[in-house]
């Protein structure tokens, strides 16, 4: 991925919360590229040694993934081309809470954005009619 220019691209994240034991979504969007093979997505968690997830050249690249996330992450591969870099996190744990970075490289340039992810036992509010 030596093709990326020196320009910045816009990356947008949204703070979110995950229910322990359920699946969660870490939301991230970016300026799309016309070639999937030119897009690199890296998810990092502050303080964690390995990567949370990496997607490059049209597929997952998980050789550098931290073991705390092994088997628990996925991007929406068919939506990457339209600028969706959101991460699905399976079986959310209390220790998944923290600051995450969505880092994007495309032929247009690079960009990143952070998001705060909270975890807990959240319940849907009851509606009494």
């Amino acid at each position: 991925f030596g093709i990326s220019g020196r320009h910045s691209i816009t990356v947008t994240t949204v703070a979110s919360a995950g229910n322990i034991g359920e699946d969660g979504i870490l939301s991230c969007t970016f300026e799309p590229d016309i070639k999937l093979s030119d897009i690199v997505i890296q998810w990092l968690k502050e303080g964690v040694l390995g990567l949370v997830h990496e997607f490059k050249e049209g597929k997952d690249e998980l050789s550098e993934q931290d073991e705390m996330f092994r088997g628990r992450t996925a991007v929406f591969a068919d939506q990457v081309i339209v600028g969706n870099a959101s991460l699905r996190l399976k079986n959310v744990q209390l220790t998944d809470a923290g600051t995450y970075k969505c880092y994007i490289i495309t032929s247009k340039g690079k960009g990143n954005a952070n998001l705060e992810y909270k975890t807990g036992a959240f319940s849907m509010p009851e509606v009494n009619v």
Epitope: F1, Q42, L44, E46, G47, V48, L49, E64, E67, M68, T95, G98, K101, Y103, I105, K110, N112
Partner: antibody, heavy 117, light 107 residues
Framework: EVQLLESGGGLVKPGGSLRLSCAAS????????MHWVRQAPGKGLEWVAV????????YYADSVKGRFTISRDDSKNTLYLQMNSLKTEDTAVYYC??????????WGQGTLVTVSS | DIQMTQSPSSLSASVGDRVTITCRAS??????LNWYQQKPGKAPKLLIY???SLQGGVPSRFSGSGSGTDFTLTISSLQPEDFATYYC?????????FGGGTKVEIK
């Protein structure tokens, strides 16, 4: 203020032992992997060891493997480096550093370890 | 182990100069490259992480570029406080390794 403060350095004879401490403040210590990095007098930086945020993974430089042990006590917000079988070539300033975004983002001021007979 | 080679090992420059330091990895390290500044008697300070991301509080005259094996740290207009030693560091595999350093001196 985010801060790391090393202590425990000093003069020790070859073959001796020393335990370094690094007191952390101003951040959630238990959420971060932590490193030790050293610098021999007039030389460059050398990574020594790392411990993951939960203490489950530890990695060492070949030069210290089997002699040094990294550990942490999250209840005390403190990182440790137990150094045994010290050699003259272990003489250096030892820094503790926080693992941020894939990098050493916060460093302590360093503590000098001198190994000499 | 991944070897990191910095060049030059030292350079002389004047205030206002554009300064470029290069770092080469012995194998592909993607964008997992960091740059640090160290002044005599002080701890190192993180400048750039992930090859090109500027650490908070670091002046915008510092920039990083590159991927794979070849990386560059650029100081667009050297300031008096920038005279120091600069180190690159790979973060892709253990043992983590540093370049030998580049000392930036006053001409």
């Amino acid at each position: 203020e985010v801060q790391l403060l090393e202590s425990g350095g000093g003069l020790v004879k070859p073959g001796g032992s020393l335990r370094l401490s690094c007191a952390a403040s101003g951040f959630t210590f238990s959420s971060y992997a932590m490193h030790w990095v050293r610098q021999a007098p007039g030389k460059g930086l050398e990574w020594v060891a790392v411990i993951s945020y939960d203490g489950s993974n530890k990695y060492y430089a070949d030069s210290v493997k089997g002699r040094f042990t990294i550990s942490r006590d999250d209840s005390k917000n403190t990182l440790y480096l137990q150094m045994n079988s010290l050699k003259t070539e272990d003489t250096a300033v030892y820094y503790c550093a926080r693992h941020g975004w894939d990098a050493f983002d916060i460093w302590g001021q360093g503590t000098l370890v001198t190994v000499s007979s | 182990d991944i070897q990191m080679t910095q060049s030059p090992s030292s350079l002389s420059a004047s205030v206002g100069d554009r300064v470029t330091i290069t770092c080469r990895a012995s194998q592909d390290i993607s964008n997992r490259l960091n740059w640090y500044q160290q002044k005599p008697g002080k701890a190192p300070k993180l400048l750039i992480y992930l090859a090109s991301s500027l650490q908070g509080g670091v002046p915008s005259r510092f920039s990083g570029s590159g991927s794979g094996t070849d990386f560059t740290l650029t100081i667009s207009s050297l300031q008096p406080e920038d005279f120091a030693t600069y180190y690159c560091q790979q973060a892709i595999s253990f043992p983590l390794t540093f370049g030998g350093g580049t000392k930036v001196e006053i001409k």
